[in-house]
């Protein structure tokens, strides 16, 4: 007979998800020189452990820390890029400005982007079946506990002048209850952040507002000076001349404003 | 334990100058931002703006953009705020409270406060 | 910028009566509001920050609640060295704005 299994009301974890895992951690090394020490299996081993056996209801950040461990890696000062509700033109940025970092070009965000997982209270099996859905279910499930907690590590390790892209095109430019908003904001350390610099990405064409003057973006600017640091922001009008600009700079129309 | 002391009380004439000081103790000076907030006679509070401890970088509310500045000696642990050009209604007592935030939770809190620098302008 | 309404302005409470002080605001603030006690003569204390929180040391006998643009302080049992004024400061956005006060006298 098939045993019980609890149904949640999320996706269960992506197919062939230690596969995945180990195959992304694999390539991440190759390609990635500082990080060749890594052993792919002991993060992987790292990873399961976090998830399997237990009540995907009750994950807590300790159990992530043996993987936060292995995944150690430091950013450059002035190269972290945070990002919320627009984590595509975030991720194109970095990939032609190779100098620069979000989370999800580090080992562990690597390793885990897009993917759902989640095990099974007493049993070594993982649940492909359901997940725990954050709204709906409970908060403290696999997929968001680990996303909180390298979040907060990524934040709590930046330095200098600290750079987040936001989604202008969303009612709530910047959200309270968003990744960035409930968990990076409040790690970043004043004795090594300079500054926050945010740049909100316009939608429209014809889209000529300051949306730097949006009550949000006030609001995020409070939370940042009462941690002492620094707050600037810029209107990104043209995403797509600013992504083409990045590439190359030298064009003439890139030094009007983008 | 924490404290912010503020200099004694200053008279003054329009169009003189005062230079108000506030200095911490017990705590790491430049992890924290400095706030100022006025209260003239019989009146509520106002937040005039805050003091990067960092960088000395200040921010002041649209009313007290001109005449004010905030300035900061990190050695001294101690932030400044000066008014130029005084007038009548700059009579008030200027307080400097400075912005906690909890390392493990999202809690900030102007918690701190100096006694107060009463300034009386009158000719 | 935000608007804080604060009343009533003032208040004569008898000892051992429960005092509730009210502040609205014109945008949302979440549940970034501030108390502050100021007796006179003396720097404004803080009683309950930001998300209802109760500062160390303060008694318990005092609370507040409110999310949004409605928040109101409480506290219970009002003993003479409750005489004072009382502020809600908002913190949720710049610049930050304190309502009127409330002067707390002994009916």
């Known amino acids: 007979l098939p045993r019980w299994r609890q149904q949640w009301s999320g996706s269960g974890t992506t197919s062939r998800f230690p596969e995945t895992v180990l195959a992304r951690c694999v390539k991440y090394t190759e390609v990635h020189p500082e990080m060749r020490h890594v052993d792919c299996q002991s993060v992987w081993d790292a990873f399961k452990g976090a998830f399997i056996s237990k009540y995907p209801c009750n994950i807590t950040e300790e159990d992530y820390q043996p993987l936060v461990k292995l995944g150690t890696q430091t950013v450059p000062c002035n190269k972290t890029l945070l990002w919320s509700r627009i984590k595509d033109l975030a991720h194109q940025f970095t990939q032609v400005q190779r100098d620069m970092f979000t989370l999800e070009d580090m080992l562990l965000g690597y390793l885990a982007d897009d993917l759902t997982w989640c095990g099974e209270f007493n049993t070594f099996e993982i649940n492909y079946q359901s997940c725990p859905d954050w709204r709906k279910d409970c908060s403290n499930n696999p997929v968001s506990v680990f996303w909180k907690t390298v979040s907060r590590r990524f934040a709590e390790t930046a330095c200098g002048v600290v750079h987040v892209m936001l989604n202008g095109s969303r009612s709530k430019i910047f959200d309270k209850n968003s990744t960035f908003g409930s968990v990076e904001v409040h790690n970043l350390q004043p004795e090594k952040v300079q500054a926050l610099e945010a740049w909100v990405i316009h939608g429209g064409r014809e889209d000529s507002r300051d949306l730097c003057q949006d009550p949000t973006i006030k609001e995020l600017e409070s939370i940042i000076s009462k941690r002492n640091i620094r707050f600037f922001c810029k209107n990104i009008y043209r995403p797509d001349k600013f992504l083409q600009c990045v590439k190359n700079p030298e064009d003439s129309s890139c030094l009007s404003g983008i | 334990q924490i404290q912010l002391v503020q200099s004694g009380p200053e008279l003054k004439k329009p169009g003189e100058t005062v230079k108000i000081s506030c200095k911490a103790s017990?705590?790491?000076?430049?992890?924290?931002?400095m706030n100022w907030v006025k209260q003239a006679p019989g009146e509520d509070l106002k937040w005039m703006g805050w003091l990067n401890t960092n960088t000395g970088e200040p921010t002041y509310a649209e009313e007290f953009k001109g005449r004010f500045a905030f300035s900061l000696e990190t050695s001294a642990s101690t932030a400044y705020l000066q008014i130029n050009n005084l007038r009548n209604e700059d009579t008030a007592t200027y307080f400097c409270?400075?912005?906690?935030?909890?390392?493990?939770?999202?809690?900030?809190?102007?918690?701190?406060w100096g006694q107060g620098t009463s300034v009386t302008v009158s000719s | 910028e935000t608007i804080v309404t604060q009343f009533p302005a003032s208040l004569s409470m008898a000892i051992g009566e429960k005092v509730t002080i009210r502040c609205i605001t014109s945008t949302d603030i979440d549940d970034d509001m501030n108390w502050y006690q100021q007796r006179p003569g003396e720097p404004p204390k803080l009683l309950i920050s930001?998300?209802?929180t109760l500062r160390p040391g303060v008694p318990s006998r005092f609370s507040s609640s409110g999310y949004g643009t409605d928040f109101v302080f409480t506290f219970e049992n009002m003993l003479s060295e409750d005489v004072a004024d009382y502020y809600c400061?908002?913190?949720?956005?710049?610049?930050?704005?304190v309502g009127g006060g409330t002067r707390l006298e002994i009916k």
């Open positions: 930001e998300g209802n």
């Open positions: 409270a400075r912005w906690y935030y909890g390392s493990s939770d999202n809690s900030y809190a102007m918690d701190y």
């Open positions: 400061l908002q913190s949720d956005s710049l610049p930050y704005t």
């Open positions: 017990g705590y790491t000076f430049t992890n924290y931002g």
